[in-house]
């Protein structure tokens, strides 16, 4: 793993414990909470990050209209079960034996049930819409500058292949970033759009997961982009299954 050899830290995940106990004395890093070894040359999976977070001490373009099947993460934090690859297990349960099914980004996609609830497969989230509202500025950002900087951010900071950033929409003060990644498109080694979106969300909230100086300083032609509100919509390859009671609530 390419953790920094000189001081043995994980550049892409500060929620780790690192020590030079890998092969040949190489630096090896393990995620807090799960103890799983992580690859510090890329993003850590959202499941392992959530688990680490729960273990840590408490502290004229038209905009896209989310589909009726789009999910928003209203349930907030929970301590997830991750598979040996660090992905979310399809079924998640809490300490009181309440269970539910989640998608590949860990967002609930069914009503809550009991231990008899079956989740046959982990349904892939193939389309993520990140909806941002920025603080008023003297003038609107230039759309092409904003587009270029956001694409550069996802490419260089989150190591997401440019083909997965489908579009950047802008109608001051709303910015929308569309990420698309079908199962068939995702090759071995590709960063998952769900992981990139989670790192971005934490960055935007001033809770950077990267080692370093602890904050995303995103600028468009020198002007800081100050995000006042973030909403993230998740679209799954198979629509979610909620009861009519929830849909009409």
């Amino acid at each position: 793993h390419t953790a920094a050899q000189d001081n043995c830290t994980c550049p892409t995940n500060k929620m780790t414990v690192c020590s030079p106990d890998g092969p040949g004395g190489r630096c090896q890093c393990r995620a807090l909470g799960s103890g799983m070894a992580v690859d510090c040359s890329t993003l850590t999976s959202k499941c392992l990050l959530l688990k680490a977070r729960m273990s840590a001490p408490k502290n004229a373009r038209t905009l896209v209209r989310p589909s009726e099947h789009a999910l928003v993460d209203n349930d907030g934090l929970y301590d997830p079960d991750c598979d040996p690859e660090g992905r979310f297990k399809a079924r998640q349960c809490n300490q009181t034996s309440v269970c539910w099914c989640v998608n590949s980004v860990g967002v609930r996609r069914t009503d809550k049930g009991d231990l008899s609830l079956r989740c046959d497969e982990l349904v892939r989230t193939h389309h993520i819409l990140i909806d941002l509202r920025h603080r008023p500025t003297a003038g609107a950002f230039n759309h092409s500058d904003l587009d270029a900087e956001l694409r550069r951010l996802f490419r260089e900071r989150y190591r997401l292949h440019p083909k997965f950033v489908a579009a950047v929409h802008y109608e001051q003060p709303t910015i929308q970033i569309e990420l698309r990644q079908n199962t068939s498109q995702k090759a071995a080694g590709d960063v998952d759009i769900g992981d990139a979106a989670y790192y971005f969300e934490r960055d935007i909230k001033g809770e950077s997961l990267f080692q370093g100086r602890g904050g995303l300083d995103l600028r468009v032609r020198g002007e800081p982009l100050q995000v006042e509100r973030t909403l993230i919509y998740y679209l799954d390859e198979i629509p979610p299954k909620f009861s009519m009671k929830r849909l009409t609530a």
Epitope: H134, D145, I204, G206, G215, D217, R221, V227
Partner: antibody, heavy 119, light 112 residues
Framework: QVQLQESGPGLVKPSETLSLTCTVS????????VNWIRQPPGKGLEWIGV???????NYNSALMSRVTISKDTSKNQFSLKLSSVTAADTAVYYC?????????????WGQGTLVTVSS | DIVMTQSPDSLAVSLGERATINCKSS????????????LAWYQQKPGQPPKLLIY???SRESGVPDRFSGSGSGTDFTLTISSLQAEDVAVYYC????????FGGGTKVEIK
């Protein structure tokens, strides 16, 4: 490791153009930008301008009409040009790396080069 | 343009005593989204380039002794050296990066 080194003529005549080069190593010019800062003898620091990693530039409004910053990726160099110089432009000129999305802090500086404007 | 005003211009403090430098900006440096202040402190010794000490107003740069601390938010900021050492004799500058960059005028710290 990250290194920056300023170079250029130590003496420039009034009304001429001051040209300096910042040669960098240990990082990619497409991932990081570079700032230019100057310091007149015995005085404080003055920010001149920046070329961001994305290639756009911003300049100090007081110097904007006279300043140009550019880069040559193939040579790992950033350059500063300041036109129509006067004695007031005599200073130590520094280049410093922009820390990209990690905050606009200047954690890496060159040693600086003294430029004297005199006939 | 944002104006940064430092005080005092110079400061003489006995070894082991506390040194306090103030910096005031002409507008708020707080990013409302990340709740971080775009303010840094630098130390410059004669014949050397400045050295980053503090960023985000209160975060200490790696390798900087813990006797250096930064505080404040919005428009008023402070750099404190809790117990002055001989090697701390230098000029200290605050710098805003909220709207491009501006340095304060500097504060010279000497031993009394």
């Amino acid at each position: 490791q990250v290194q920056l080194q300023e170079s250029g003529p130590g003496l420039v005549k009034p009304s001429e153009t001051l040209s300096l080069t910042c040669t960098v190593s240990g990082f990619s010019l497409t991932s990081y930008g570079v700032n230019w800062i100057r310091q007149p003898p015995g005085k404080g620091l003055e920010w001149i301008g920046v070329m961001w990693a994305g290639g756009s530039t911003n300049y100090n409004s007081a110097l904007m009409s006279r300043v140009t910053i550019s880069k040559d990726t193939s040579k790992n160099q950033f350059s500063l040009k300041l036109s129509s110089v006067t004695a007031a432009d005599t200073a130590v000129y520094y280049c410093a790396r922009d820390e990209n999305w990690d905050g606009a802090w200047f954690a890496y500086w060159g040693q600086g080069t003294l430029v004297t404007v005199s006939s | 343009d944002i104006v940064m005003t430092q005080s005092p211009d110079s400061l003489a403090v006995s070894l082991g005593e506390r040194a306090t430098i103030n910096c005031k900006s002409s507008q708020s440096l707080l990013n409302s989204g990340t709740r971080k202040n775009y303010l840094a402190w630098y130390q410059q010794k004669p014949g050397q380039p400045p050295k980053l000490l503090i960023y985000w107003a209160s975060s200490r740069e790696s390798g900087v002794p813990d006797r250096f601390s930064g505080s404040g938010s919005g428009t008023d900021f402070t750099l404190t050296i809790s117990s002055l050492q001989a090697e701390d004799v230098a000029v200290y500058y605050c710098k805003q990066s909220y709207n491009l960059f501006t340095f304060g005028g500097g504060t010279k710290v000497e031993i009394k």
